[in-house]
């Protein structure tokens, strides 16, 4: 039975040209995280594999940095980066957990972060 839950940074906004950290946290399960995939709609941004480390998709190498932790940092944001992002936790033996983050990239300097939480 899958007992875990994923907390995310929720709906967030950031300025064009700036950077943002996408972060998820899996709790309430003793399952072992084997891999975390970061996806934007149908595009794979990056993989963090527990055994094999990071892989950044070649088309995002210039604008994506691994971490902190299992999170992902998006840099040099453009308005086209607005949209849904998913953290997909592959775990053993539970299976797959998915978290959703909505990022809005704003032209102006009035961007504010949405709900925040501390990752332990």
């Amino acid at each position: 039975m899958m007992t875990g839950t994923i907390e995310t940074t929720g709906n967030i906004s950031a300025e064009k040209g700036g950077s943002i950290i996408l972060q998820c946290h899996l709790s309430s399960t003793t399952a072992q995280v084997t891999q975390v995939n970061w996806e934007q709609q149908d595009q794979l941004l990056a993989i963090c594999n527990a055994d094999l480390g990071w892989h950044i998709s070649p088309s995002f190498k210039d604008r994506v940095a691994p971490g902190p932790g299992l999170g992902l940092t998006l840099q040099s944001l453009t308005v086209n980066d607005t949209g849904e992002y998913f953290c997909i936790y592959h775990t053993y033996p539970d299976g797959t957990y998915t978290g959703r983050i909505f990022l809005e990239v704003l032209e102006s300097s009035v961007a504010e972060h949405g709900a925040r939480f501390q990752i332990p």
Partner: antibody, heavy 118, light 107 residues
């Protein structure tokens, strides 16, 4: 304390196989990956592959794929690395090494010298 | 695979000297770099990980710095027990690769 103890030195003929063991103690064997790294005489270090002792996932360096087999025995907290079709350039010290944290190696076995000679 | 280029391949120094070893990966590895010390007939010993974090029990005369494609290991005041070979290793994404080593010898 954390310790990895490897099997003794081996001398093999070209074309033969060798199986090196690595017994872990001082921690929960299934909690941390076990890597195998080799070092030819006077040379640098070369990563061979990794096994996750918990669910058995194995990943090999492409250079060794097809010639190396990694296994583990949870009941004895022992990992094994078998290398087939040995050639003289496989002469090296073979180390097992834990990545206790993330993908660097902070606990090493003492090494096993494998000599391939006709 | 990421290639790790270490320099120099060897150096001679005296006790008390400041020693610097560099490591240049072939591509950006962010801060995913480790340094090891190896003495003849012994297994490597972890000194530094995440480019600058000192491993447990490592003396403070050792320090690591750098990110991206340029990293440095510094020994601020060389001690007799520091004469050894030093290797860098990236721990970004497999396959993990090592530099060719830097042998620190007594002048």
């Amino acid at each position: 304390q954390l310790q990895l103890v490897q099997s003794g030195a081996e001398v093999k003929k070209p074309g033969a196989s060798v199986k090196v063991s690595c017994k872990a103690s001082g921690y929960s064997f299934t909690d941390y990956n076990m890597n195998w790294v080799r070092q030819a005489p006077g040379q640098s270090l070369e990563w061979i592959g990794v096994i996750n002792p918990n669910h058995g996932t194995i990943s090999y360096n492409q250079k060794f794929k097809g010639r190396v087999t990694m296994t583990r025995d949870q009941s004895t907290s022992t990992a094994y690395m078998e290398l087939n079709s040995l050639r003289s350039e496989d002469t090296a010290v073979y180390y097992c090494a834990n990545n206790w944290d993330v993908w660097y190696f902070d606990v090493w076995g003492q090494g096993t010298l494998v000599t391939v000679s006709s | 695979d990421i290639q790790m280029t270490q320099s120099p391949s060897s150096l001679s120094a005296s006790v008390g000297d400041r020693v610097t070893i560099t490591c240049r990966p072939s591509e950006n590895i962010y801060s995913y770099l480790a340094w090891y010390q190896q003495k003849p007939g012994k297994a490597p010993k972890l000194l530094v990980y995440n480019a600058k974090a000192l491993a447990e029990g490592v003396p403070s005369r050792f320090s690591g710095s750098g990110s991206g494609t340029d990293f440095t290991l510094t020994i601020s005041s060389l001690q007799p027990e520091d004469f050894a070979t030093y290797y860098c290793q990236h721990h970004f994404g497999a396959p993990w690769t090592f530099g060719q080593g830097t042998k620190v010898e007594i002048k």
